[in-house]
């Protein structure tokens, strides 16, 4: 016997207690492939989530977090707490970055300044709890006898850098 | 690539005043920060004065604090050196400097330096 639920496509499912007949996806519910047998419930964007995608007879609703929060997890499974720049987020709330740290974002951890004699270079300016370290010219490029002269053409541009 | 031009350098007597500008050109949105430094004769260069271009945030060589200031203007792509209360060891030539990129490092590895060609400031009386 021919199996006619998979001739149903995407927003409806087959329905068994019909003589399989392609029946539309009930309200609240979704399918969002062509022959399936129930509609999934529609995700609901409540409380720290809103909606950014409505939910559609073929889509799941999509969300976002309320201002304050930010997204973690795949599809925005769960919503943390934003801290300012210069700040981590730790079990206590938002705490302010130890010296010489930063964090230039409103989520994620401080993380240590650049060590510029690491790579060689002087510091150009200091870092903050928001910035990190601007590193400037080699030790060499300030030695007595040292050309000014700007290093040659790159081989290709660089990206846009914050501002 | 970022070209940088120094002006306003000159003789001046000390206690007098000079303002030296640094006018960029070129692919100036990538650059995060500027500095000032000078170099005397035989000596090394140092750092006098930097600023964040973003955030105006600067930072001052203790020689020449209270008597420089490092400001810029974004909508001219110009970074400027007010040199006040000027003294016989301020003479040197004075070198503008840019950089594109926080840490030491940049994206895909490329780091990039510009340097002016300098601008002479004499004090003497």
């Known amino acids: 016997l021919q199996d006619l639920c998979s001739n149903c496509p995407a927003g409806t499912f087959c329905d068994n207690n019909r003589s399989q007949i392609c029946s539309p996806c009930p309200p609240n519910s979704f399918s969002s492939a062509g022959g399936q047998r129930t509609c999934d419930i529609c995700r609901q964007c409540k409380g720290v989530f809103k909606t950014r995608k409505e939910c559609s007879s073929t889509s799941n609703a999509e969300c976002d977090c309320i201002s304050g929060y930010h997204c973690l997890g795949a599809e925005c499974s769960m919503c943390e707490q934003d801290c300012k720049q210069g700040q981590e987020l730790t079990k206590k709330g938002c705490k302010d970055c130890c010296f010489g740290t930063f964090n230039d974002q409103k989520r994620g951890i401080c993380r240590p300044w650049t060590n510029c004699s690491l790579d060689g270079k002087s510091v150009l300016v200091n870092g903050t709890k928001e910035r990190d370290v601007v590193c400037g010219p080699s030790p060499a490029d300030l030695s007595p006898g040292a050309s000014s002269a700007t290093p040659p053409a790159p081989a290709r541009e660089p990206g846009h850098s914050p501002q | 690539q970022v070209q940088l031009v120094e002006s306003g350098g000159g003789v001046v007597q000390p206690g007098r005043s000079l303002r030296l500008s640094c006018a960029a050109s070129?692919?100036?949105?990538?650059?995060?920060?500027m500095g000032w430094y000078r170099q005397a004769p035989g000596k090394q260069r140092e750092l006098v004065a930097s600023i964040i271009t973003g955030d105006g945030d600067t930072n001052y060589a203790d020689s020449v604090k209270g008597r420089f200031t490092i400001s810029r203007d974004n909508s001219k792509n110009t970074m400027y050196l007010q040199m006040n209360s000027l003294k016989p060891e301020d003479t040197a030539v004075y070198y503008c400097?840019?950089?594109?990129?926080?840490?030491?490092?940049?994206?895909?590895?490329?780091?990039?330096?510009?340097w002016g060609q300098g601008t002479q400031v004499t004090v003497s009386s």
């Open positions: 070129g692919s100036t949105f990538s650059i995060v920060a």
């Open positions: 400097y840019a950089r594109t990129g926080y840490g030491s490092s940049w994206l895909m590895g490329h780091e990039y330096d510009y």
